[in-house]
């Protein structure tokens, strides 16, 4: 195994709000990540950067700094939240997400995350990309893995 393994687990929760006038959707998406340190020494996770894409457009970004250190042969589960905005040229989604006649308003989002660890002045970056279903019509908490979209093009890391 590589010295540090990063596994994107899935969406933990999605909290939604709307701006009726602007026909804008605000989604606060909390994701879960497992970082495993296969080394004999402990490592420092310097930062986690994440972005969310909808229809190939970046709709949200987040960065966490000085996250944690992980002991040897240890694994840490980290939650991080990405605030996203679906607006402007994608405001047509407002109608779909607020449609009362349907119960689940799932949209497919691409979650990208990069974990940076620092080794004596040089950085190692490990990235993951996963497609996930998120309900844009209501606040939702997910069982881990429940929001998984068919990641045919994304081999398991």
């Amino acid at each position: 195994p590589r010295s540090i393994d990063v596994k994107y687990i899935g969406v933990k929760s999605a909290y939604v709000s709307y701006d009726v006038q602007k026909r804008t959707i605000y989604l606060n998406i909390t994701n879960t990540l497992n970082i495993t340190n296969n080394n004999y020494y402990s490592v420092e996770v310097e930062n986690i950067t994440a972005q969310v894409q909808f229809a190939k457009t970046v709709i949200g970004k987040a960065r966490l700094n000085n996250i944690t250190h992980i002991g040897p042969l240890d694994m840490k589960q980290i939650d991080y939240t990405v605030p996203t905005v679906i607006a402007e040229e994608m405001s047509y989604m407002y109608d779909f997400c607020t449609l009362i006649s349907i119960k689940v308003h799932n949209i497919v989002l691409m979650m990208q995350v990069t974990v940076t660890t620092t080794y004596f002045g040089h950085s190692e970056q490990i990235s993951q990309e996963r497609y996930q279903y998120v309900d844009c019509g209501r606040n939702t908490t997910y069982q881990l893995g429940q929001s998984e979209y068919l990641n045919v093009l994304q081999p398991q890391q």
């Epitope: 080394n39 004999y40 020494y41 402990s42 420092e44 002991g71 042969l73 240890d74 694994m75």
Partner: antibody, heavy 122, light 112 residues
Framework: QVQLQQSGAELVRPGTSVKVSCKAS????????IEWVKQRPGQGLEWIGV????????KYNEKLKGKATLTADKSSSTAYMQLSSLTSVDSAVYFC???????????????WGQGTSVTVSS | DVLMTQTPLSLPVSLGDHASISCRSS???????????LEWYLQKPGQSPKLLIY???NRFSGVPDRFSGSGSGTDFTLKISRVEAEDLGVYYC?????????FGSGTKLEIK
């Protein structure tokens, strides 16, 4: 002072299991790794595996084909090695040792237990 | 697995002599942080092994300065400048860079 006190000698039947303990004292148990080493009579040393008592994370010598299972009990500062499906080739002295680590570096096995003799015989 | 080849298997010496033990690894044992984790242990009859040298050349606390370690890449050496009676026993090199970690076969330091 730092001590690793291992359990006493065992005489066991082929096909059975045995659990060897290694009780740590004189240091913060979860801040060090515990390694296990095998020595057959008149032979050299063979690395079995390692456990991080803080997390329970382990690495094993795959050549031993699942022979050993390493665990640790933080509340009693004790590491354990369970050996299963014992045969005559498992007759050996088993040592535990501690290894320190830090950010991006680690140290050597500076303190060792006295060894536990396991004899497999019918 | 990384094979650690120690020579000689037996090293007869007189007290006060210099002694040199070689340890050769079958591949580089540089760890992913740039350090080489090559260690030397001494085991006396009926005792647990004791740490002498770590990271190729660093003497463990309490180890006399007549012991020195050197080497890089795949070739490593333990030298004892003036052998004393308490130095007798079996010396093992040990690599901690590739799982499974492996010991050399041992070198028995004995009186001529």
């Amino acid at each position: 002072q730092v001590q690793l006190q291992q359990s006493g000698a065992e005489l066991v039947r082929p096909g059975t299991s045995v659990k060897v303990s290694c009780k740590a004292s004189g240091y913060a148990f979860t801040n060090y790794l515990i390694e296990w080493v095998k020595q057959r009579p008149g032979q050299g040393l063979e690395w079995i595996g390692v456990i991080n008592p803080g997390s329970g994370g382990t690495k094993y010598n795959e050549k031993l084909k699942g022979k050993a299972t390493l665990t640790a009990d933080k509340s009693s500062s004790t590491a354990y090695m369970q050996l299963s499906s014992l045969t005559s080739v498992d007759s050996a002295v088993y040592f535990c040792a501690r290894r320190g680590y830090t950010i991006y570096d680690f140290y050597a096995m500076d303190y060792w237990g006295q060894g536990t003799s396991v004899t497999v015989s019918s | 697995d990384v094979l650690m080849t120690q020579t000689p298997l037996s090293l007869p010496v007189s007290l006060g002599d210099h002694a040199s033990i070689s340890c050769r690894s079958s591949q580089s044992i540089v760890y992913n942080n740039g350090n080489t984790y090559l260690e030397w242990y001494l085991q006396k009859p009926g005792q647990s092994p004791k740490l002498l040298i770590y990271k190729v050349s660093n003497r463990f606390s309490g180890v006399p300065d007549r012991f020195s370690g050197s080497g890089s890449g795949t070739d490593f050496t333990l030298k004892i400048s003036r052998v004393e009676a308490e130095d007798l026993g079996v010396y093992y090199c040990f690599q901690v860079s590739h799982v499974p970690f492996t010991f050399g076969s041992g070198t028995k330091l004995e009186i001529k």
